[in-house]
């Protein structure tokens, strides 16, 4: 997260590191006692997910592994839409005070509405500097109209655009997969933006997780 | 330091095949995807195709669609471009190159190979 | 596929000459555009990004403008280190990334 603040702490249960190893990979949001979702471009073969804890490494927090993940079946690794994934934990999280599921969108929430996006990415870019506490930043939902003067035909319909005007907070390398949470919901996965990160006008890109709650909750009911 | 080191030249028969390594070292591998990019001798930059080293998920030049496969080693941090049934064409250097960006897209190349050449004759 | 002319192809100029290289597209790539040079035997070199933003480490007489399907690289005063190839290429509408076909400035 470029130009954020550091998260209150405990105030986001759902956030998940996924680890390759001990390195930061991307970020998920639990939804369920064994699902985490993410972004589809975060695939791997398979994943050490860490739940319950602001700090990254911390040893006192969860860590199950995962082995299957589930892609949104139109994700394109050329346009990037559907950038959503499912990951299956290996076993069920305990859930407590420290380990929630995020409430999953009911609608879809207007421009102009206020979020958080929230990772342990790089605050720092192009050289990169992680952070071992979780950063968050506050945006604002932006218009597909006006993202689309930014991002042109780049910016798909289920893609949702957040930031500040002329601010450089935003996303970099390691949010991928986060969420962003407007009114207590998840409304976005990370999914990209411009490089070197952080310039301003240029938001932040999400996947629109409104448009994914019927995939989401399907896949879960297939492959539990 | 941050760089990727690549395999000397081979010098290969018509029809035959060739695997060109890519070695990263000084960033996380992980991270960012690795482009090949083909300069036959005296002509201009081709672009051939990418893969991401963490997903291994690809995207190919449509001329070279079943004769190139691009892999990965996260173990090793390497790359490899294999280029099958050779043609005399395809005599070039061959460079690996970083894409600069995060999540889905990468926007530039902002780091290179030393180059590979290949060469292929009768 | 988006097709990226560059031109001229070749060049000669001077020490200290101001030099101009423009880059087409065939179609708006808003300004997702990047510059590279390469010298003979060498991998090429990062420039610019972006259409104009100048990458770490290069020396500010090169710059760079543009937007939609036209762009240039100007060099502001040209230094004997400057003579080499260079080539545009495009990352608005990918795959494929598409490069144009490289201008080599050469000493007059």
């Known amino acids: 997260i470029i130009d954020g603040y550091k998260c209150k702490e405990g105030s986001h249960p759902w956030q998940v590191a996924l680890l390759k190893g001990n390195q930061l990979h991307c970020g998920g949001v639990l939804v369920d006692k064994y699902w985490v979702l993410t972004a589809a471009h975060c695939k791997m073969g398979q994943y050490q997910v860490q739940l319950g804890s602001d700090k990254i490494g911390d040893q006192s927090a969860q860590k199950i592994k995962a082995t299957k993940s589930f892609r949104h079946p139109g994700y394109s690794t050329k346009t990037h839409v559907n950038d959503i994934m499912l990951v299956r934990l290996d076993e069920p999280v305990k859930m407590s005070s420290k380990v929630e599921a995020v409430q999953l969108p009911e609608h879809c929430e207007p421009p102009g509405t206020s979020c958080t996006v929230s990772g342990w990415g790089t605050t720092t870019s192009p050289d990169v500097t992680f952070p071992s506490d979780l950063m968050c930043s506050d945006v604002k939902l932006i218009s597909s109209r006006e993202c689309k003067k930014v991002y042109k035909d780049l910016l798909g319909k289920t893609m949702l655009c957040a930031g500040i005007p002329d601010s450089k907070t935003n996303t970099c390398n390691g949010d991928s997969g986060g969420p962003l949470v407007c009114n207590d919901t998840l409304q976005g996965l990370v999914s990209w933006g411009t490089y070197p990160c952080g310039q301003p006008n240029d938001p932040g890109v999400y996947t629109q997780v409104c448009k994914y709650k019927r995939w989401v909750m399907e896949t879960m009911k297939t492959h539990r | 330091q941050v760089q990727l080191v690549q395999s000397g030249a081979e010098v290969k028969k018509p029809g035959a095949s060739v695997k060109v390594s890519c070695k990263a070292s000084g960033y996380t591998f992980t991270s960012e995807g690795i482009h090949w990019v083909r300069q036959a001798p005296g002509q201009g930059l081709e672009w051939m195709g990418s893969?991401?080293?963490?997903?291994?998920?690809?995207n190919y030049a449509q001329k070279l669609q079943g004769r190139v496969t691009m892999t990965t080693d996260t173990s090793t941090s390497t790359a490899y471009m294999e280029l099958r049934s050779l043609r005399s064409d395809d005599t070039a250097v061959y460079y690996c190159?970083?894409?600069?960006?995060?999540?889905?897209?990468?926007?530039?190349?902002?780091?290179w190979g030393q180059g590979t050449m290949v060469t292929v004759s009768s | 596929d988006i097709q990226m002319t560059q031109s001229p192809s070749s060049l000669s100029a001077s020490v200290g000459d101001r030099v101009t290289i423009t880059c087409r597209a065939s179609?708006?790539?808003?300004?997702?555009l990047n510059w590279y040079q390469q010298k003979p035997g060498k991998a090429p070199k990062l420039l610019i990004y972006?259409?104009?933003s100048l990458q770490s480490g290069v020396p500010s007489r090169f710059s760079g403008s543009g937007s939609g399907t036209d762009f240039t690289l100007t060099i502001s005063s040209l230094q004997p280190e400057d003579f080499a190839t260079y080539y545009c290429?495009?990352?608005?509408?990918?795959?494929?990334?598409?490069f144009g076909g490289g201008t080599k400035v050469e000493i007059k």
């Open positions: 179609q708006s790539i808003s300004s997702y």
């Open positions: 190159a970083r894409g600069a960006g995060y999540g889905a897209r990468d926007w530039y190349f902002d780091l």
């Open positions: 893969i991401s080293a963490s997903s291994g998920d690809t």
């Open positions: 290429d495009q990352r608005y509408s990918t795959p494929p990334i598409t």
């Open positions: 972006g259409a104009s």
